[in-house]
């Protein structure tokens, strides 16, 4: 689950579960910073606006990131 706060990492738990790119409203990638030493990925789902922290090391999540970036590059002129 994500928690909002000013300091430290946002994600308290992370999921390995694959996410369907079509069900994604938004994918937030937070790079490492002075507050949090690792990348954090927060998916916002279209259904109910539910959020989920994703495991950046998971194969399924890496594939999701590839799919999303491919989709974005198709859209951009």
């Amino acid at each position: 689950i994500p928690l909002s706060r000013t300091v430290r990492c946002t994600c308290i738990s992370i999921s390995n579960q694959p996410v369907n790119p079509r069900s994604l409203e938004k994918l937030e990638i937070i790079p490492p910073s002075q507050f949090c030493p690792h990348v954090e990925i927060i998916a916002t789902m279209k259904k109910k606006g539910e959020k989920r922290c994703l495991n950046p090391e998971s194969k399924a999540i890496k594939n999701l990131l590839k799919a999303v970036s491919k989709e974005r590059s198709k859209r951009s002129p």
């Epitope: 689950i1 909002s4 994600c11 738990s13 992370i14 390995n16 539910e50």
Partner: antibody, heavy 121, light 109 residues
Framework: QVQLVESGGGVVQPGRSLRLSCAAS????????MHWVRQAPGKGLEWVAL????????YYADSVKGRFTISRDNSKNTLYLQMNSLRAEDTAVFYC??????????????WGQGTTVTVSS | EIVLTQSPGTLSLSPGERATLSCRAS???????LAWYQQKPGQAPRLLIY???SRATGIPDRFSGSGSGTDFTLTISRLEPEDFAVYYC??????????FGPGTKVDIK
Amino acid sequence: QVQLVESGGGVVQPGRSLRLSCAASGFTFSNCGMHWVRQAPGKGLEWVALIGYDGINEYYADSVKGRFTISRDNSKNTLYLQMNSLRAEDTAVFYCARDWPEGYYNGMDVWGQGTTVTVSS
Amino acid sequence: EIVLTQSPGTLSLSPGERATLSCRASQSVSSSYLAWYQQKPGQAPRLLIYGASSRATGIPDRFSGSGSGTDFTLTISRLEPEDFAVYYCQQYGSSPPFTFGPGTKVDIK
């Protein structure tokens, strides 16, 4: 199967220390935030502390702040609660619980059976 | 800190009856952040409802949750003998503490 087993409870004198452990099995412990929740005899549930999956984030109830420390060893699939300066009002059953990771907040979906801490002179 | 109030303190009903339990927050709670638990004597709590209205895995459909803002409800449509227990609501706001309500005891009339 998914399981949490607490240990380390017992009878201790006021002002002394105790360390509780919670052994996790059947799931990817290193992906899950973990909580300690306690229940005084005949009373309701009280959230005590939370630690993030990576050990970076720690949160405490005001009643234990500065006295209790939550920690974890992901290589051993174990959660800990170090309790110092114990008081009579800390007497309770202590449960560890898993923070369900498959959503924004899906509650504490797996609980241990609890370990009893009695603070008495 | 958000304070949760549960009512009634005790609910005396017979098997087959409908139970309606209330949980009120001292300030608005996002629906995503409210859960209900059941606890039987000598046992650990069990997650029933998360996100105010979603049933946890394996929870029978006689249990349902509703509400938003400061008022939330747990409904048990037809009480089974195994449903007599204490029920707690819990809020999980954007930062701790993650408070529990004081509980509602559902006992046999």
